[in-house]
């Protein structure tokens, strides 16, 4: 808002731009025929000090000479770095009442020299891309600092460019604009950056490089590949780059993986065959070039080639497993169940399971295909039995696997001893046993299988099971085991043509049963009384139930009362007691126990026995 | 059609200064390189400066390193080459050119890579 310096004029010595720590003299001088009017003596000349439009410091007190009425010279000291305005204002003394009128102003600046700038780097992108560098300018000049890039190079040549730094943009970067080609890979070229403000200039030291330092291929472009013979491991991935390429590098690696399986090729050309690939998965493919063997930069990485390679038929073989169940003199059913094939071994998606029965001495031969993991037939009792699967894909089936069906616990001799099933953690159980005491032939293998101990389990969930070597006696069981649930739990020892099992109850993790038995009836009979009860709804026993406890006493006794506890067996629902008078009401009650401890007590049933007492 | 006018051009005393114009008509040259090139009698034509407009940047031979300087008017699609600190060996018919991209470093220097071309305007730095 300074009217143009009409009043007159402010100068600065030594100049207006300064080093910071240095001092000032700003003066401030009126034109002829200036000032108050009557009292040219009256005339006060004010310095105001702005720092951001903001008055920050009224100088009167720096006045270092005065010519009163006509000029004052004020002296600046600790001014900080950027820009101070200083404006000069007259005062006219005997007139309190007006403002002091402004004289004129001047702007300060404060910085520093520039530092030589360092860390010259220059980069061009692609063969056919432009020279640019960068640099580190140092500190801040608070200036306006200008910068000359500055590249000689063959044929007598010198490129240069200028950009300038101040409080709005830095400068720290140029892009020449020129192509530097691959006819000057020998050639050397040096570049310098100088800058000058102000206070003082200052040059980098010269940076030497060739045309190989700094070209960055770019990243190769249009991959793709091609499976020979619709083959699943091998391929040949294709991609396009620069000319001058001599060197690539190949990354892929399978989607789900953390690691890449690394390649180098040498003028490959845009044409790589790959040996190893797993077939029917699906992989991503990167490339990365460079301009030289030894020297030079490599490229940033393609973008990704995504894609699935093809399938290849099945390997490995399905582990098989079967449940026996007869159903009249002369029919049984048997049901067999596969675990699916793993995806290395699977290969591709499986479309069916090929299973086969078949009677071994009169050639009797039962075929289907699923595409479930559980087949069931009815079948004769007689004859000698074995089954096989094989799973197919598009391009052809596994290896049939056979197992021979026998009476999976129908040999006592073969039933493996002292089973016992600890809780390890929340979600597995460890199953061990020792060996079969006086087994006639040799165990094959231990088969440990489990199911969930719920109603209809059997015909709604297929088994769980583990392959066991015969030298094994432990198992760890986690697949589908869950806490506070009890399972059923089998140990097979299968030789060639039998089979013995034995079998126990395990849980992962117990606590207290929710709630006891509802005792449903007590029967007088033969002078013994029967308690009948319902089991505890699956979700409440919150565990294996070791035993059911019977309690009892008489009606308004404060007595404790007896007891009887019942190994606990699902197949059981009444228990005889034979201790109670007769003539004397007494009232029932059932509990549960699992390892983690009691339930509360079930309903209570008050009865009178009506017979002799024992 | 593409014109190239150059003027400025006369006699001058040896550390004399002289300034160049180059007027260019016809079409934009926003991404041409434009120079100027001489030939002194007898001698084979020689680069001597180029602007490159896209890019702001300057190319100069090592003989007029730091006594020349180029620089232009995108309005009135102008170049000018200002000769400071002149000699006797700068005496040559100095020819205004504009050539279209790619910019390579090895064709900027290279008359053959031009494809416009002035009439030419006459400096002598003589005492």
């Known amino acids: 808002n300074i009217d143009v310096c009409k009043l007159g004029t402010v100068t600065v010595q030594p100049a207006p731009v300064i080093p910071l720590g240095s001092a000032a003299n700003i003066s401030c001088s009126l034109n002829p025929k200036q000032g108050c009017s009557h009292y040219p003596s009256s005339n006060e000349l004010i310095l105001l000090k702005f720092v951001n439009d903001v008055l920050v410091e009224n100088l009167h007190g720096k006045k270092v000479h005065d010519h009163t009425g006509h000029s004052s010279t004020f002296q600046v000291t600790n001014l900080s770095l950027g820009m101070t305005l200083f404006v000069c204002k007259l005062n006219c003394s005997n007139s309190q009442k007006k403002p002091p009128v402004p004289v004129c102003g001047v702007e300060i600046s404060v910085g520093v020299a520039p530092e030589p700038p360092q860390n010259i780097s220059c980069v061009q992108e692609g063969e056919n891309g432009t020279v640019a560098c960068s640099w580190n300018s140092g500190k801040v000049t608070y200036l306006k600092t200008n910068y000359t890039l500055q590249l000689s190079g063959p044929n007598n040549l010198t490129c240069q460019k200028q950009c300038f730094s101040d409080n709005r943009q830095n400068c720290n970067r140029l892009d020449l604009g020129i192509n530097l080609s691959p006819d000057l890979a020998e050639s050397r070229f040096i570049v310098r950056v100088t800058a000058i403000n102000d206070l003082g200039n200052s040059s980098s030291l010269p940076h030497t490089f060739t045309f190989l330092d700094i070209v960055i291929p770019l990243p190769p472009w249009d991959i793709r590949i091609n499976f020979l013979n619709a083959s699943g491991s091998r391929g040949t991935l294709q991609w396009e780059d620069e000319g001058q390429v001599v060197l690539n590098q190949l990354r892929y690696q399978p989607l789900n993986s953390t690691s890449w399986n690394m390649v180098n090729a040498t003028n490959a050309k845009g044409k790589y065959d790959l040996r190893d690939l797993r077939p029917f998965t699906e992989y991503e493919f990167q490339i990365s070039s460079k301009l030289h063997l030894s020297g030079g930069s490599w490229s940033n990485w393609s973008e990704s080639l995504r894609t699935r390679t093809p399938e290849e038929e099945p390997v490995g073989i399905l582990d098989i497993w079967y449940m026996k169940q007869d159903i009249d003199y002369d029919r049984q059913q048997i049901s067999l169940f596969w675990k699916s094939l793993n995806p290395s071994e699977a290969r591709g998606k499986i479309l069916h399971y090929q299973v086969t029965l078949q009677e071994v001495t009169k050639k009797t031969t039962l075929q289907n295909t699923t595409r479930h993991t559980s087949w069931t037939r009815v079948i004769p009792r007689t004859g000698a039995w074995t089954a096989s699967v094989s799973a197919a894909n598009s391009k052809g089936a596994s290896a049939p696997t056979h197992i021979n069906i026998v009476d999976l616990c129908g040999t006592g001799l073969l039933a493996p001893h002292q089973v016992s099933a600890k809780s390890e953690n929340m979600d597995n159980i460890l199953v061990t046993w020792q060996p079969p005491k006086k087994a006639d032939s040799a165990v094959r293998e231990y088969i440990v299988e489990w199911r969930a101990l719920q109603p209809g389990s059997i015909t709604k969930f297929p088994p769980h099971w583990l392959r066991i070597p015969p030298d094994n006696m432990s198992a760890l069981i986690s697949e589908n085991i869950k806490p506070y649930i009890c399972y059923e739990i089998r140990v097979h020892a299968l030789s060639e043509s039998q089979g013995g099992c034995s079998s126990i109850r395990g849980d992962s993790k117990h606590k207290a049963p929710v709630s006891g038995p509802h005792i449903t009836a007590i029967t007088e009979k033969k002078e013994r009384l029967f308690i009948s009860w319902t089991h505890i709804p699956f979700p409440e026993q919150r565990g294996c139930i070791l035993h059911y406890r019977i309690y009892w006493k008489e009606r308004d006794s404060t007595a404790q009362p007896e007891l009887c506890e019942i190994q606990y067996r699902r197949s059981q629902n009444s228990h005889p007691i034979s201790s109670l008078q007769p003539r004397v009401t007494y009232v029932l009650w059932m509990t549960a126990v699992t390892a983690a401890g009691e339930s509360p007590q079930g309903n209570e049933r008050e009865f009178c026995p009506q017979g002799k007492a024992n | 059609q593409v014109q190239l006018q150059e003027s400025g051009g006369g006699l001058v005393q040896p550390g004399g200064s002289l300034r160049l114009s180059c007027a260019a008509s016809?079409?934009?040259?926003?991404?041409?390189?434009m120079g100027w090139f001489r030939q002194a009698p007898g001698k084979e034509r020689e680069f001597v400066a180029a602007l490159m407009w896209s890019a702001g940047s300057e190319f100069y031979t090592d003989s007029v390193k730091g006594r020349f300087s180029i620089s232009g008017d995108g309005a009135k699609n102008t170049v000018y080459l200002q000769m400071n600190s002149l000699k006797a060996e700068d005496t040559a018919v100095y020819y205004c050119?504009?050539?279209?991209?790619?910019?390579?470093?090895?064709?900027?220097?290279?008359?053959?890579?031009?494809?416009?071309w002035g009439q030419g305007t006459q400096v002598t730095v003589s005492s």
């Open positions: 016809g079409r934009t040259f926003s991404n041409s390189v």
């Open positions: 050119a504009a050539k279209n991209p790619p910019h390579r470093w090895s064709d900027i220097g290279k008359s053959p890579h031009y494809e416009y």
